[in-house]
């Protein structure tokens, strides 16, 4: 009969290296009598015999982990006890070796130029994988802006347009290499105007093209504003090439305007906007490209019918595509503006404008317009419409206005010929000869300080006294 013998572990446990999903075995050979009970612990926690992840054989001397998981690493101990003497224990470590695995791969990123971008790449593996990045087909080099963090993430400071592209991270250890899917870094750029529209000074009825070029990512949209309102007239043509949008606004100019080009693009829920403005002003119509060339015809319009002399030939300026329509449209626009002026000023201004836009045809070999006599122009400016004219000139340097006389095609009185020099070289305004009650009923005008610029108006069959300087008698 054998003598009782306390357990002795003849093969101490060793460190076991195992790959994930592979089999790992610990052997705990024990000599003893009677036969010992062998139990196993992992990190001091008893492994239950019925745990199907383990197989315990050879009377408990062999522990097999059937499919190693990364969470199985730790200290495994076998404890043998047969009641003779004390229990004995031997321990060994399980090191789960793991091919690289990317646990948090990078994702597509949209980032605004100049900001910081971080592309994540969290990995697992044993040994710990090293992480590198590929952009396009080439390994990405780190520099002062671009760094691979300890975590494996890629950080790009002050993102530039050229950083846009496809990226993937690479995790590598002695057991293998893992690649993330390709992700896209899109660099968004705030809308910026490359070419602002140019201001123009044109004749009434001209066609003008305003051009505005903008860049941005995504490609901006361009809208146009005319005097604060969305453009209603004209047509817009757009083309896009290499992230640059070129917008051309075609206009038929019948009034001055402030035109604003607005380039907008969207970044997530936010928008970026860039603006540029240009003015289109109307040159005094008689200073046209045709050097006052045109033809003479009877006035067939409506607006000036009551103002112009019956059956007189008036000058139509062929620098306009359709002179009669263009000049009528201009006077129509002017007429609406006159609604804002005083009852004293309005009829005088109407007479001035009609005779300025539809000048009497000067007889001669080549048709030329006969301008208004300076004295009559000045009478309207300094008598009938003194208040309005002053307001207009006071604000002239401030650009565009919405009411009164500022948008009207008024002549420059000082540039008109004087009737005293050549009475046949200029046109009189019948209104000033006929409507004396318009002046005499306004005492404030008759006492106004006479202008040194205004010589006496001519004698007339229906003359009227104004003030000494304006005397028509």
């Amino acid at each position: 009969e054998k003598l009782p013998k306390a357990p002795v572990i003849t093969t101490p446990l060793e460190t076991v290296d195992a790959l994930v999903e592979e089999v790992a075995t610990f052997m705990c050979a024990v000599e003893s009598y009677p036969q010992p009970e062998i139990s196993w612990t992992r990190n001091k926690i008893l492994i239950k015999l019925f745990d199907t992840r383990y197989s315990i054989r050879e009377n408990g001397q062999l522990l097999t982990i059937l499919s190693v998981e990364d969470s199985d690493d730790g200290i495994y101990c076998c404890i043998a006890n047969n009641g003779v003497g004390g229990a004995v224990e031997s321990c060994g470590a399980l090191q789960v070796k793991m091919k690289p695995k990317i646990t948090r791969p990078p994702i597509n990123v949209k980032i605004i130029e100049g900001l910081k971008a971080v592309l994540p790449c969290t990995t697992m593996g044993n040994p710990k994988p090293s992480v590198s990045w590929i952009k396009g087909d080439n390994a990405l080099r780190e520099n002062s802006r671009i760094a691979v963090l300890e975590s494996g993430s890629l950080r790009i400071h002050n993102v530039q347009k050229e950083d846009a592209g496809q990226y993937r991270c690479v995790a590598k250890n002695s057991l293998g290499t893992a690649y993330s899917k390709l992700v896209k870094l899109e660099v968004e750029v705030f809308a910026r105007i490359l070419r602002a529209p140019e201001s123009h000074n044109v004749t009434f009825g001209s066609f003008v093209t305003l051009r505005c070029t903008a860049i941005g990512i995504p490609v901006p949209t361009i809208s146009w504003i005319e005097n604060g309102n969305a453009v209603s007239s004209g047509s817009i043509q757009e083309s896009v090439k290499d992230r640059v949008i070129d917008s051309r606004l075609q206009l038929f100019i019948t009034k001055p305007g402030l035109y604003t080009c607005i380039a907008t693009n969207k970044h997530g829920e936010k928008f970026s906007t860039a603006k540029a403005a240009a003015t289109v002003s109307i040159a005094e119509w008689s200073k046209s490209q045709k050097d006052s060339q045109g033809y003479c015809a009877q006035y067939r319009g409506e607006v000036c019918d009551a103002v112009l002399a019956k059956d007189a030939l008036v000058f139509f300026n062929t620098s306009y595509r359709d002179p009669e329509d263009a000049q009528e449209l201009l006077i129509h626009t002017a007429w609406n503006e006159l609604k804002a002026v005083s009852p004293l000023c309005r009829p005088a201004a109407e007479a001035l404008l009609c005779n300025h836009l539809f000048q009497e045809c000067s007889p001669g070999v080549v048709p030329t317009p006969m301008p208004i006599c300076r004295e009559y122009c000045l009478a309207v400016k300094e008598l009938f419409c003194a208040k309005e004219w002053q307001a207009m000139e006071g604000k002239a340097h401030r650009g565009l206005y919405r009411s009164g006389m500022h948008l009207l095609p008024v002549p420059e009185c000082s540039k008109l010929p004087s009737m005293h020099r050549d009475p046949t070289a200029c046109t009189r305004l019948p209104y000033l000869d006929y409507k004396k009650e318009n002046i005499t009923t306004f005492p404030s005008i008759t006492s106004s300080r006479p202008s040194a610029d205004i010589p006496n108006l001519p004698a007339s069959t229906s003359s009227f006294a104004v003030s000494p300087a304006y005397s028509m008698t």
Epitope: Q289, K290, D291, Q293, G294, Y295, C296, A297, L313, T318, P323, C361, P363, G364, V365, V366, P367
Partner: antibody, heavy 121, light 107 residues
């Protein structure tokens, strides 16, 4: 409807003065906005403007012919005339009178049928 | 003096478009007139002030004038359009100038 009609000798000797008259009917030569020109066309060649008289009697001449050309008018007969001195065979041409109208940008809207003038000895 | 240049001849197929040009220094700043002349007849004005048609002239006659070229366009040329065509301008010195003329042949 205005009508213009040229008249004058068909043959002129070299070095002489060529005189042609244009009679205007259906409108006055003193009417504002009209002018009256002489234009000629050598055989097989293009048109050449020679000069103009305006409604008020003022005259303007082609720079190349200025020294030899004179245009006058007779308002009582509603006629205007061309005088071209020191003619040479190069002055052989069909001579037209025409009305220029301010209503049509001073274009020539009425032409005579033309009169053939030959300069030959 | 002011020179107006026209090509001597232009051919066009029946009912096709003919373009006759008149070149002159900055002619676009002047009013251009066009005249049609058939053999043995006096000229007839077909366009004035660059593009305006006198009454009685068919709509197929149109014109344009910009830069250094004035153009007479006959859209859908007819056999009766075969003629010589002359351009004409007035200069600022009250001188009239004619182009050398273009003979239009309708094939």
């Amino acid at each position: 409807q205005v009508q213009v009609q040229e008249s004058g000798p068909g043959l002129v000797k070299p070095s002489q003065t060529l005189s042609l008259t244009c009679t205007v009917s259906g409108g006055s030569i003193t009417a504002r906005y009209y002018s009256w020109s002489w234009i000629r066309q050598p055989p097989g060649k293009g048109l050449e403007w020679m000069g103009v008289i305006a409604y008020d009697g003022s005259t303007y001449y082609s720079p190349s012919l200025k020294s030899r050309t004179s245009i006058s008018r007779d308002t009582s007969k509603n006629q205007f005339s061309l005088h071209l001195s020191s003619v040479t065979p190069d002055d052989t041409a069909v001579y037209y009178c025409a009305r220029g109208s301010s209503r049509v940008a001073a274009a020539f809207d009425s032409w005579g049928q033309g009169t053939q003038v030959t300069v030959s000895s | 003096s002011y020179e107006l240049t026209q090509s001597p001849s232009v051919s066009v197929a029946l009912r096709q478009t003919a373009k006759i040009t008149c070149g002159g220094d900055n002619i676009g700043s002047k009013n251009a007139q066009w005249y049609q002349q058939k053999p043995g007849q006096a000229p007839v004005m077909v366009l004035y002030a660059d593009s305006r048609r006198p009454s009685g002239i068919p709509e197929r006659f149109s014109g344009s004038n910009s830069g250094n070229t004035a153009t007479l366009t006959i859209s859908g040329a007819q056999a009766e359009d075969e003629a010589d065509y002359y351009c004409h301008v007035w200069d600022s010195s009250t001188n009239a100038w004619f182009g050398g003329g273009t003979h239009l042949t309708v094939l």
